[in-house]
Amino acid sequence: TIPPHVQKSVNNDMIVTDNNGAVKFPQLCKFCDVRFSTCDNQKSCMSNCSITSICEKPQEVCVAVWRKNDENITLETVCHDPKLPYHDFILEDAASPKCIMKEKKKPGETFFMCSCSSDECNDNIIFSEEYNTSNPDLLLVIFQ
């Protein structure tokens, strides 16, 4: 990925189109890799990541990973291709415009991950149950 302040051309070698044949361009994501975080026991948190990047590949989406163990809490923000697993997990929610955290089983830690496909959507990570997309009415709200 290419942070906006870096003087480097975006890689346009791979042209991605949607179902209608429209060209897809790389989106914007927060991209601070792994940072210590104070986000804990909250419905939602801001990433506090000051680096906004144009993702390197058009198909990439925004990802956030929240991890808590006995020693610390970290928040990871990146761009990633949803066709590829991340931390051994499939990005199930990559089409969502919002980053709705879902817990994943990892031994020795609490591990939440979300992915989303609107600009800088991994800047605001949402843990709240009210965004649980098993409710079809909420699906309409989130994807309108």
Epitope: K24, F25, D119
Partner: antibody, heavy 122, light 107 residues
Amino acid sequence: EVQLVESGGGLVQPGGSLRLSCAASGFTFDINAMTWVRQAPGKGLEWVSVISGSGGTTYYADSVKGRFTISRDNSKNTLYLQMNSLRAEDTAVYYCARRGQYREIAGATDYWGQGTLVTVSS
Amino acid sequence: DIQMTQSPSSLSASVGDRVTITCRASQSISSYLNWYQQKPGKAPKLLIYAASSLQSGVPSRFSGSGSGTDFTLTISSLQPEDFATYYCQQSYSTPPTFGQGTKVEIK
């Protein structure tokens, strides 16, 4: 239909303050970055500020940094520009505009309001 | 900041003419170049995004080309409603700077 309607412009003395508002409708407000662009009388377009959809990230032009504050209330679908320590050179029509998603239209500013005139004069 | 330089600053043309406006960036911006049209007393209108993609509802006589630092807006056959000021803008990095504008006037 996407609509952006600015308000709050007017005549203010140098050193004074003004708060512009922009009411948005017709799209999912909280996933789009929003910008303010201004145009001094008879001059070109000057980008002023941008705020991310969540409100967590803001940027400012050097000419307004420390004096202007961009903010948004996603529950009200409204964008704001708080302008303090106004100068004569801030006189312009201020446009509220939506930044399109990078994935879709590469971050171009796709919808604009009609503008509101701010005049700074004693 | 990335500087955007448009040329010419103004031009006179007749209905039916082919008109070309150029925009140069001070550093490579890949294809992140947009073109806007503004008529007096009105807000700007997006014509072309990502250097060459036509915005929905914009007539096909408008086209854009270029990549890297040099870009062109072409109006294949100028119509009476096309007399306006045209601006380029880069959306590659913040701040998303504009060119100084090109005024297209009636000859």
